[in-house]
């Protein structure tokens, strides 16, 4: 708390502007008006206050809106943002993705910091889905922003919004996440043909069950070695050696330097030793041939 | 008086790693920024990454972005860097300083970290 | 990055001569500059913050002026102890960069 003093006399501000600079914390407290600063926020960022001149404007803003800021001041804040708490931005309303890409701005460059997050989640949650200019915008400042949300989180992601969404954006989604955003992005892309759709597909493939990697085998689509190593290891084990070579096309001779990894190693102990000997890669560790092969897990279905 | 006082510099293999402390005196360390900032011997000065007084706002310069990591410890009064993968061009003399957003106004001596095999 | 450039990159002058050294940025900078002192062997000394002001405890012999991309520190008459460098900064954004010096020497 900065102490009630007396603004001395001629000290007293009539604008927001460079003299502030040198005024003392005590000073500014008494000399600035809050509501003259509440209408020349957009002044504040272009002048070279310190951080603890800014911790005075703050407070004097919180005087002033002790219910939390009107759009029309978060919009302007600019570097005061950093200087907020999530409990602050907790008592925000904002609505328009325009102050939502002034704030995202001042932080550019930081790592996300608890400030953004929370300001995010109230944003996201103020407009009750996650459209796509939002998406658009959170994956512009943040690309690892869609993997960082729950499974939960994800659900409430409008298909139409997949089409914001780029490569880079899911590198760090685990297969939980991906088993959400898949369904969405093949309503999103259904569309597309053949070619073109494997190209939006493709990076969302994480979450595609068998049947669905069945059909993408019979497309020539050419799927390379990282995308097939990023597939569900319960969604591969039923492919064929036929519909795996189909799949990957001429990137098949791949499987041989991963044969020792997920899911690769285990889809191969899955398969005929002479149905990989087909591929003529030299894959080993398949069921030796006259063995009878049960599938436990129909069995189990069954029962 | 107000002071800050480096450690952990010295000789370190390329591709090892350091960590750089920074003890603060005579202010209310919690209530300011800081920054880490390098001189290589006969060069200039470069700023490489700042933390805000509650630790929730970090930036690094790109040349050490991934490498090191800036921390602080408020209870402590303490100022950290972390410093992994380490090159030749990291050799420097490494400052702390209270970092008042418009200047830096108080300096560390400096510690010197030397990158060589 | 903003780009700080100083010039001269180095000067001779005798004790009692006034002294100007100029920093230009590569783009605007409003009043975000810093000038700073460095003796060798030294960390550096904050001068003059927010492009013009004295920073407590610094004589006021140092002064800066100027905003947006052009500004100068002068010292108004040196003194003895005022042979060093002296660097500018800019913190206008990030990452934050200095100018590479002028060195003040002894004629």
């Known amino acids: 708390e900065v102490e009630k003093t007396a603004c001395p006399s001629g000290k007293k501000a009539r604008e927001i502007d460079e003299s502030l600079i040198f005024y003392k914390k005590w000073e500014l407290e008494a000399c600035v008006d809050a509501a003259l600063l509440a209408t020349q926020m957009d002044r504040v960022n272009a002048i070279p206050f310190t951080y603890e001149q800014l911790d005075v404007l703050k407070h004097k803003l919180d005087e002033l809106y002790p219910q939390g800021y009107p759009e029309s001041v978060i919009q302007h804040l600019g570097y005061l943002f950093l200087k907020m708490s999530p409990e602050d931005i907790r008592k925000w309303n904002v609505t328009s993705l325009e102050t939502l890409k002034a704030l995202l701005e001042v932080n550019k460059g930081h790592e996300m910091s608890p400030q953004v997050a929370t300001l995010i989640d109230r944003f996201v949650k103020g407009r009750g889905q996650l459209d796509k200019d939002t998406l658009d915008t959170l994956t512009a400042f943040y690309p690892g922003y869609l993997c960082s949300l729950s499974p939960e989180e994800l659900s409430s992601v409008p298909p139409s919004s997949i089409w914001a969404v780029r490569p880079q954006d899911l590198d760090t989604c685990d297969p939980r996440q991906l088993d959400v955003l898949y369904p969405k992005a093949r309503l999103a892309f259904q569309n597309m043909n053949g070619s073109e759709y494997f190209v939006k597909i493709q990076s969302f493939l994480g979450g595609a069950p068998t049947e669905d990697l069945k059909a993408l085998s019979q497309q020539n689509v050419s799927m390379d070695l990282a995308t097939f190593m990023k597939l569900r290891t319960d969604a591969v084990l039923p492919l064929t050696v036929a519909e795996v070579q189909k799949l990957l096309g001429p990137h098949v001779e791949g499987l041989k330097a991963e044969e020792r990894h997920r899911p690769v190693r285990d889809w191969i102990l899955r398969q005929r030793q002479d149905d990989l000997d087909t591929l003529g890669l030299g894959l080993q560790g398949g069921i030796p041939n006259g063995y009878l092969v049960l599938d436990l897990s129909m069995q189990e279905a069954l029962s | 008086q107000v002071q800050l006082v480096e450690s952990g510099g010295g000789l370190v293999k390329p591709g090892g790693s350091l960590r750089l402390s920074c003890a603060a005196s005579?202010?209310?360390?919690?209530?300011?920024?800081m920054s880490w900032i390098r001189q290589a011997p006969g060069k200039c000065l470069e700023w490489i990454s700042y933390?805000?007084?509650?630790?929730?706002?970090?930036y690094y310069a790109d040349s050490v972005k991934g490498r090191f990591t800036i921390s602080r410890d408020n209870a402590k009064n303490s100022l950290y860097l972390q410093m992994n993968s380490l090159r030749a061009e990291d050799t420097a003399v490494y400052y702390c300083?209270?970092?008042?957003?418009?200047?830096?106004?108080?300096w560390g001596q400096g510690t010197m970290v030397t990158v060589s095999s | 990055a903003i780009q700080m450039t100083q010039s001269p990159s180095s000067l001779s002058a005798s004790v009692g001569d006034r002294v100007t050294i100029t920093c230009r940025a590569s783009?605007?900078?409003?009043?975000?500059l810093a000038w700073y002192q460095q003796k060798p062997g030294k960390a550096p000394k904050l001068l003059i913050y927010?492009?013009?002001g004295l920073q407590s405890g610094v004589p006021s012999r140092f002064s800066g002026s100027g905003s947006g991309t052009d500004f100068t520190l002068t010292i108004s008459s040196l003194q003895p102890e005022d042979f060093a460098t002296y660097y500018c900064q800019q913190s206008y954004s990030n990452p934050l960069t200095f100018g590479c010096g002028t060195k003040v020497e002894i004629k």
């Open positions: 300083a209270r970092d008042q957003r418009n200047a830096f106004d108080i």
């Open positions: 933390i805000s007084n509650s630790g929730s706002t970090i």
């Open positions: 005579g202010f209310t360390f919690s209530d300011h920024y």
């Open positions: 927010a492009a013009s």
């Open positions: 783009q605007g900078i409003g009043s975000w």
